[in-house]
Interface confidence: medium
Amino acid sequence: CKAMHVAQPAVVLASSRGIASFVCEYASPGKATEVRVTVLRQADSQVTEVCAATYMMGNELTFLDDSICTGTSSGNQVNLTIQGLRAMDTGLYICKVELMYPPPYYLGIGNGTQIYVIDPEPCPDSDF
């Protein structure tokens, strides 16, 4: 299939509230009108789909209501935010971009962003 370059940061540290954001940028070879973005998680050689959204160029990304992902698009950049992360979710998060329409179909897969999640220390009990 037609390959497309996708760039994303190598490492991101999630916030104490379990939120991680990163930019996924693709080098669009053509004038796509509809783009599909998928976030994959790779851990222990297992790859699972975290979330996916299809959007029209110039419009907002729409993830499913129960998705842990949100995002915005600007040109050939997608700003992705993953919420509700815990330490066990640490892993490599790969951005996959597909230019769906019009033909030809293009596929690009980033090298992945290593997201580190550290669970916050529980607050000590207080006598006050």
Partner: antibody, heavy 118, light 108 residues
Framework: QVQLVQTGGGVVQPGRSLRLSCAAS????????MSWVRQAPGKGLEWVSA????????YYADSVKGRFTISRDNSKNTLYLQMNSLRAEDTAVYYC???????????WGRATLVTVSS | EIVLTQSPGTLSLSPGERATLSCRAS???????LAWYQQKPGQAPRLLIY???SRATGIPDRFSGSGSGTDFTLTISRLEPEDFAVYYC?????????FGGGTKVEIK
């Protein structure tokens, strides 16, 4: 295996309208881009129109642009082709077909004959 | 628009013979995005080959595709009685999607 059942063909006068339907079995209908392809009597195949799986993107051949409208209702697993201002040269057998990601046609309906004649 | 020209228009052969069908594009078909279809009278087309050389599910291995750029070939190694039909090529490397005019393979 998805199956495509077409309805809505017939004889119509020039300038009039007709709507074709293509009902798909299977729960993955919204995963497929869909197209309409036609074949004039004794002639070859001509791609007419396509629509993305979400229905958000539509494409037309120049020969039908502005006259035909492709749409889909994913809740009903049905594809439509609204044909307005029909001309004699639109007379053909019309096929609905599923598109792979790569835009070849992997599954075809059984055909609907549209005859435009006065 | 990419124009596809198929030749010959008609191929007269006997069962057991080898059939070689040509599809030539007016400009290069990127990534070999070319498909072949078989159509029998009164039936819908059936996908045989995609990506210029990959056989679709359930297609016998006597059908093979080759080529790149502007020249593509469909080969049927040994014609079976059910192979006599019209064959179309289609490019999907650019919009609009276009088909060739077809090659009819008939019994000699």
């Amino acid at each position: 295996q998805v199956q495509l059942v077409q309805t809505g063909g017939g004889v119509v006068q020039p300038g009039r309208s007709l709507r074709l339907s293509c009902a798909a079995s299977g729960s993955t209908f919204s995963s497929y881009a869909m197209s309409w392809v036609r074949q004039a009597p004794g002639k070859g195949l001509e791609w007419v129109s396509a629509i993305s799986g979400s229905g958000g993107s539509t494409y037309y051949a120049d020969s039908v642009k502005g006259r035909f409208t492709i749409s889909r209702d994913n809740s009903k697993n049905t594809l439509y082709l609204q044909m307005n201002s029909l001309r004699a040269e639109d007379t053909a057998v019309y096929y609905c077909a599923t598109n792979s990601l790569y835009w070849y046609f992997d599954l075809w309906g059984r055909a609907t004959l549209v005859t435009v004649s006065s | 628009e990419i124009v596809l020209t198929q030749s010959p228009g008609t191929l007269s052969l006997s069962p057991g013979e080898r059939a070689t069908l040509s599809c030539r594009a007016s400009q290069s078909v990127s990534s070999s995005y070319l498909a072949w279809y078989q159509q029998k009278p009164g039936q819908a087309p059936r996908l045989l080959i995609y990506g210029a050389s990959s056989r679709a599910t359930g297609i016998p291995d006597r059908f093979s595709g080759s080529g790149s750029g502007t020249d593509f070939t469909l080969t049927i190694s040994r014609l079976e009685p059910e192979d006599f039909a019209v064959y179309y090529c289609q490019q999907y490397g650019s919009s609009p999607l276009t088909f060739g005019g077809g090659t009819k393979v008939e019994i000699k």
